[in-house]
Structure formats: C-alpha cells, structure tokens
Amino acid sequence: SEGRKTWRRRGQQPPPPPRTEAAPAAGQPVESFPLDFTAVEGNMDSFMAQVKSLAQSLYPCSAQQLNEDLRLHLLLNTSVTCNDGSPAGYYLKESRGSRRWLLFLEGGWYCFNRENCDSRYDTMRRLMSSRDWPRTRTGTGILSSQPEENPYWWNANMVFIPYCSSDVWSGASSKSEKNEYAFMGALIIQEVVRELLGRGLSGAKVLLLAGSSAGGTGVLLNVDRVAEQLEKLGYPAIQVRGLADSGWFLDNKQYRRSDCIDTINCAPTDAIRRGIRYWSGMVPERCQRQFKEGEEWNCFFGYKVYPTLRCPVFVVQWLFDEAQLTVDNVHLTGQPVQEGQWLYIQNLGRELRGTLKDVQASFAPACLSHEIIIRSYWTDVQVKGTSLPRALHCWDRSFHDSHKASKTPMKGCPFHLVDSCPWPHCNPSCPTIRDQFTGQEMNVAQFLMHMGFDVQTVAQQQGMEPSKLLGMLSNGN
C-alpha cells in the first residue's frame, strides 16, 4: 500500500515508455551475475561493502539494469478480472541470475455486500479496478532490490500482485447479470502463476508467496493451492512457502459489540461469514474438510487454518495489530484509554501469543502497528535481538537439510520469535509512535502514560517497585 499514492491525479511525472531490452549482437556473450546467496556467513558488513562496490562499478555500464521499478503486466487471460471486469495483473522485476521468486499479495480490507462494495468502488477504485493502475511501481521493503533495504532476498525475482478483488484473495466468481461485481482473488493468483511460468518461474527453486493484511490472510488461503497447481503442471521441484504478514486475525469478541454495517465496524466473524457467501469464497481443501458445510469461514482465521497447511508458512504478526483492534472497536484516539480498553488490549496480546505457540516460524513483536514487510523500516524491528530479515534467513537455512523445515533452529539462528513483554510498545525497537493529536514522537513511557497506564497498579501486578518499572520503560527494556 505504501508507494501507491501517486496513481491517478498526480501529474508530476508521465510514466516511462515501455522498455524493450536490446538483444545482444550475434556472437556477443551475455553477461550474467548469478549472485544468489542463500546464506551470508561471516562478516555481514564486509559482504555489504563488497556488494556495494560491485554495484557501483557495474552501474556506469548498466544503469537501467539497476532500475528499482517493477513493471505492470495485465493478464493475457482477460476473463480473470478485478471486481469491475477490468483485467487483473501483476508488477514484475526479473532477476535473471536468481532462482528465487517472491510473489507479494497486496492488502486493503474487503467489502462483503452490495452497499459497501458500491461505496468502496466510488472511493477506493484502485482496489476494485485496474483501469488507472500506474505502469510501474517501486519495490520497497522485502520487494526492494537494494541489499541495504532488503538484506534477505534482494536478488530475487520480485512480483507485486495488486489487490483488486476485495475478497481476501478467496473468490472464484465472475461478473454476470446476477453479480454486479466479480470476486476472483483465488483465480487471479492461479493465473498470475500460470503466466509467470512462461517468464522464468518454471526454473525456480523457491516460490515465496507473501502478503500483508488481507494479502497475509490470502497467503494462508492460497499457499497450498499454488503448490498443488505447480505439481499438477509438472513443476514438483519448486518449493512453495508462505510469508503471512499482519493477516493472522482472531475471531474474538469485540470490545464493544456493533452492528455489521460497515467493513471496519463489523466483527471479524460476521464480516467473513457474509463475505464468503457474497464472494463464493474458496478455502484450503484440508481445512474445509475439518469444518461442516456453512462453517468454512473458520478457515480465514490463521490459528484454525495453519495446522491444516502442508506448505511451510512464516507468520509475521504485531501482537497489538491495529486492524484487529479496529474490527474489535478499540479506538485509541480518546485520551486516556479507559481501564476496560487497556485490559482488553493486554488480553489481545496474550491471546495472540497463545495462538502462535505452535507456529514453527514466527516473528511477533509487542507493538501497536499494522503491516511490516514492504515498509522500508522492516529491517529495524527486533524480537529477542533478532531482526525479521535475519529470522527469515534462519528459516531459509532450516530447509537446506530437508524439504520440511527442521523443528530445531540452528544455534544462534532462531526463527520462532514471539515477544513476551505484556504491553504495546514494550519492545524498544517498535516503529516510532506519534501522539495522534499533536503528531509528536513519543517514547514508550510517554505512550503508556498517554494510554492511561497506571504505573502503581501495573508495578503491583508485576511485583516490583513503581520507580523500577518507570526506569525500565524509559530505558525501553
């Protein structure tokens, strides 16, 4: 969603003309640098310095090869569409020396009835139509080709799949006389994979299906289907894995019950129950078998679908996810937060931590935020001293011995990382918080006070002196 803000009205820069790559003259060797490092051991700084100097020395001869942009390709099969019947598509930046492919599913909530889909169409059309998509996009975070911004997979083939189906990537119904909108999220993924096979994916070693928010849930719903699709098409050697960011929601009780009128006020279960019918939503087959007919909505919730998945999935989830709090009707704009809200928030963190207990590969910082993997600061957050790119690298390494992730991470290379401190932003590496009213940056202590945090009570709960607790908060421990 970042980097998507300049798409219709802005007149700063016309899109560049489509690039055609000049073919080398007959008999000329084609240079390629297959720098596909699976793991970088030893001195990371020295490695980065070498990469930088190599990049700089290559830059004059091939400036356009270092272009950060992913280029738009609308699907050739125009029957696979966005909500309004316009063709779906994907943005691609190839990396010819690499056998890794990263397919990223965009997020952006959903709509679940005619009224809120109409309203979405009139205010957020880019999430329902490809008619005004820009020709290029810049890859950020895990989609960046800069080693500094993406130490994890900077050299991979990058694919960004825009979300234009409003169905949490689950739908399989086309636009018709009866249906004003098409909901084809699941089919869009299948078609993108099919088209990419002709663009080099056929030679892939690893396909990482990633996504944020609704895209993160989309990963959980589609990763096994993609693996099955590739097997059926004759590519069983491609290892399919998932990376679900901010898509692991709880079907919990709302803080304040509200009628299911609008997307953001509707309880998670209500919204998905309605949506799955409206979209003709599909869920993973093994999960579907666990629930009786009409109960398929359960499979949209990570902790219920995860145990049924065959593909390895890495789960990234803020313990205090803003989208979860929004659907739970916890709005942190009043000041201070009431005690009931504060307890509800703490309990949410506890519940979420509980659901991640048996997730082999996870990264769950105790922060109040939403989405991370395509943010440029995604390298900055740490859990127990390990950053997300590092944890992903450790997860990757665990596959080298066996096809299935080994249960025990290597010493000093963990990938099950869940914060255990109990409050939002008790982790000092959390993204900066700003006072919602003044816009000023706040430290952890200020933030917690702002939220109505009672030092006396909490110190008592934790069995420590209030002064010691305040000191800990100020130091960010």
Epitope: E115, D118, S119, Y121, D122, M124, D132, Q436
Partner: antibody
Framework: DVQLLESGGGLVQPGGSRKLSCAAS????????MHWVRQAPEKGLEWVAY????????YYADTVKGRLTLSRDNSKNTLFLEMTSLRSEDTAMYYC????????????WGQGTSLTVSS | DIVLTQSPASLAVSLGQRATISCRAS??????????IHWYQQKPGQPPKLLIY???DLESGVPARFSGSGSGAAFTLNIHPVEEEDAATYYC?????????FGSGTKLEIK
C-alpha cells in the same frame, strides 16, 4: 469543463415537499459517486446523502433518513433529491458534489440551490 | 459515526505569518497507506473549494503555501505565508466510511 448545476430550491411550507435536481456535464457521470451537502445560514457544512455511481446504493445522514429520497438518471446525467415532510431546520443551501474515486474527496461542487422552509 | 473536531473555531493571523488548523477524528481514518481526510476553503457566497486531499496531496491549481499533514486521527492544515486572499472558512472532511462527516469549520481572519 466539469460542471454541476443545481435547481429546484425556493420557498416551501413546513410539511411540504420539494425535488432538487443536479445536472452534470463535462465528465462521465456514471463513473462517479455523487453526494448532496447542505449548509444552513451562517452554519457549517453538513453531509446529507450519497448515491453510488451505478445508482444501486444510496445512503443518508440520520438527520434526514426517511424524509429524503435520492435517485439518479445516468442516461440524462442528472442527480435528484426528493424531500418530504420538510421542517424549518431543512432551510439551507443545497450543494451537489462529485466524489473522486481515488479517495472520496469532493473535487467538484455546484453553485448550490437555496431552500427555505417557512410558513 | 466518525466525529471530526476542528480547532480553533476562529483565528486571526498577520500577513506573511503561519496559520495552523487542527482536525481530530474520533477514530482512525487511515487505512492501507492512505488517510481519508480532505480540506476545503469556503468564501462567503461561494461553494467550498478543494485544497488538500488524502491528508497531504495538494489539489492542482492550489498555491504551494497550503500544506496538509497527519495520519491516524490527527491532521493539520498549514498556510504559510498567509496572504490577504486566504481569509475564508476552512473545513476538514473524512471519506473513510459512510456516513461522511465534516468538521465544524475554522474562520481565518487576516490581521
């Protein structure tokens, strides 16, 4: 040139009815959600109602629910607002506004039509 | 419904100085990287005119002395340097969900 032109205002007795129109030109009318916004004398702006681009969904502010009917004729590029059981507090300048579909902001407004409800 | 609280109700600013208007939402109006807050200027006898959309984007034809910032539930409109012709009432508006609402307005007077 994008233009919106409201008409139909005037003096109406309390309990009476009135139909306001908004004629659009210079853009593909059926591509845009349309809204009515009103402004009582010396007061601020109040959002009143929304019609989706296809005309299939309408939504009203609580203050007018049950007394207003919004409709549109995309073939004639016209938006209508039918008002019944009018009260003195409905006295206002009524503006028709086009909502941009990349954010829902009102990027084009009509000049407004003035409605006075008084005996 | 989302309530927008605008402040101050009125302000007087000297020519060439900075005018700052605040708009607070009762809950977050930001989602998927966008903030659904917009700013309008209205002069007596005229319809409102769009200045800033999606919290910080300047509408074409609007002078660069107008700027918007903020995210979540807190937003600001800045005018610097203020000019004579900026005397008007300014409104914030959200389009995050239906029903849309407006702030109560801020009347700017030039000293």
């Amino acid at each position: 040139d994008v233009q919106l032109l409201e008409s139909g205002g005037g003096l109406v007795q309390p309990g009476g009815s009135r139909k306001l129109s908004c004629a659009a030109s210079g853009f593909t009318f059926s591509d845009f959600g349309m809204h009515w916004v009103r402004q009582a004398p010396e007061k601020g702006l109040e959002w009143v109602a929304y019609s989706s681009s296809g005309g299939t969904t309408v939504y009203y502010a609580d203050t007018v629910k049950g007394r207003l009917t919004l409709s549109r004729d995309n073939s004639k590029n016209t938006l209508f607002l039918e008002m019944t059981s009018l009260r003195s507090e409905d006295t206002a300048m009524y503006y028709c506004a086009r909502a941009s579909y990349d954010g829902g902001y009102f990027d084009c407004w009509g000049q407004g039509t003035s409605l006075t409800v008084s005996s | 419904d989302i309530v927008l609280t605008q402040s101050p109700a009125s302000l007087a600013v000297s020519l060439g100085q900075r005018a700052t208007i605040s708009c607070r939402a009762s809950k977050s109006v930001s989602t998927s990287g966008y903030s659904y807050i917009h700013w309008y200027q209205q002069k007596p006898g005229q319809p409102p005119k769009l200045l800033i959309y999606l919290a910080s984007d300047l509408e074409s034809g609007v002078p660069a002395r107008f700027s918007g910032s903020g995210s979540g539930a807190a937003f600001t409109l800045n005018i610097h340097p203020v000019e004579e012709e900026d005397a008007a009432t300014y409104y914030c508006h959200h389009s995050r969900e239906l029903p849309f609402t407006f702030g109560s307005g801020t009347k700017l007077e030039i000293k």
